[in-house]
């Protein structure tokens, strides 16, 4: 339950919970927007983005997109809602204490995307092939 | 009623490291409903926050004073610590434990009295 | 990170006068700004967080506006007891910042 301090202290309407009845707080997440970057063939990259904004909504999570073209490399850092596809695609990762990369299909360029629900996660981003596995006893060591 | 209290050394020499503590009574700091942290006032000044956290998210710092501060926590007996390494004059302040719902974090409804720390030599 | 500024500095009114204190940010806060009161000596209280919601046990007389960048908090009728120090407080970047300060003292 809601310690009465609380309920006195907010509006109801800022109150949301999860599926299991759980108060989901406001995330902080990096969020700059898209910005050139020099992220290229690591396995591991920071974000170099030196806004951390609170997320509007308290089931807003963080996001990064990260895009190879002919002429440039982006990195856009931002927070969004889970239940809403971005860049049309579903964040299927968003319960994630980390941002983990994943390939999606775009003509024209490479483009990865990551989502992750801890505060500032999408400031590391991570392409390491040692994350993105269906190993669940992998799976297992990363999320502990 | 959830209440704050600081306590630490009121002196602290240049170049030393000040140690304070924040003790929390009338509930507790795992309770994720509340976040929690230091602000600090120098004499005549204004507010710097100098870093936050909730039980179950990673500490926040202040980039300015990141290298230099570190907030712990010690659930058992319901407090946290801040240690702020290489202190010079411009450190001298009142330091606060705020807290505040996790639900509008960054706000804070209840305030310490505040400890004066001075750095002098 | 976001500077925000106070004006005026100090504002001098009498009790039962309307006094008006002006946040303005360096970048859009949305609506995530908060107002405090300072005696001396003593804590900062919350008065208004989210630009325009008081707090609890906050009087009537004590109302807060704006969105974006420039805000305001509005006493309707000065008591005796509001003469203190008012601070601004923005929750939208962090670290989050606060103004200068304006003072309210008695004309």
């Known amino acids: 339950t809601i310690p009465p301090h609380v309920q006195k202290s907010v509006n109801n309407d800022m109150i949301v919970t999860d599926n299991n009845g759980a108060v989901k707080f406001p995330q902080l997440c990096k969020f700059c927007d898209v910005r050139f970057s020099t992220c290229d063939n690591q396995k591991s990259c920071m974000s170099n983005c030196s806004i951390t904004s609170i997320c509007e909504k308290p089931q807003e999570v963080c996001v990064a997109v990260w895009r190879k073209n002919d002429e440039n490399i982006t990195l856009e850092t931002v927070c969004h809602d889970p239940k809403l596809p971005y860049h049309d695609f579903i964040l299927e990762d968003a319960a994630s204490p980390k941002c983990i990369m994943k390939e999606k299909k775009k003509p024209g360029e490479t483009f990865f995307m990551c989502s992750c629900s801890s505060d500032e996660c999408n400031d590391n981003i991570i392409f390491s092939e040692e994350y993105n596995t269906s190993n669940p006893d992998l799976l297992l060591v990363i999320f502990q | 009623q959830l209440q704050v209290q600081e306590s630490g050394p009121g002196l602290v020499k240049p170049s030393e490291t000040l140690s304070l503590t924040c003790t929390v009574s009338?509930?507790?700091?795992?309770?994720?409903?509340?976040?929690w942290g230091w602000i600090r006032q120098p004499p005549g000044k204004g507010l710097e926050w100098i870093g936050s956290?909730?039980?179950?998210?990673?500490?926040y710092y202040n980039p300015s004073l990141k290298s230099r501060a570190t907030i712990s926590i010690d659930t058992s007996k319901s407090q946290f610590s801040l240690k702020l390494s290489s202190v010079t004059a411009a450190d001298t302040a009142v330091y606060y434990c705020?807290?505040?719902?996790?639900?509008?974090?960054?706000?804070?409804?209840?305030w310490g009295q505040g400890t004066l720390v001075t750095v002098s030599s | 990170e976001i500077v925000l500024t106070q004006s005026p500095a100090t504002l001098s009114l009498s009790p039962g006068e309307r006094a008006t204190l002006s946040c303005r940010a360096s970048q859009s806060v949305r609506s995530y700004l908060a107002w405090y009161q300072q005696k001396p000596g003593q804590a900062p209280r919350l008065l208004i967080y989210d630009a325009s919601n008081r707090a609890t046990g906050i009087p009537a007389r004590f109302s807060g506006s704006g969105s974006g960048t420039d805000f305001t908090l509005t006493i309707s009728s000065l008591e005796p007891e509001d003469f203190a120090v008012y601070y601004c407080?923005?929750?939208?970047?962090?670290?989050?910042?606060f103004g200068q300060g304006t003072k309210v003292e008695i004309k």
């Open positions: 407080q923005q929750r939208s970047n962090w670290p989050p910042t």
């Open positions: 009338g509930g507790s700091i795992s309770n994720s409903y509340f976040s």
């Open positions: 705020p807290r505040g719902p996790t639900v509008i974090r960054g706000v804070i409804d209840s």
């Open positions: 956290f909730y039980y179950g998210e990673k500490t």
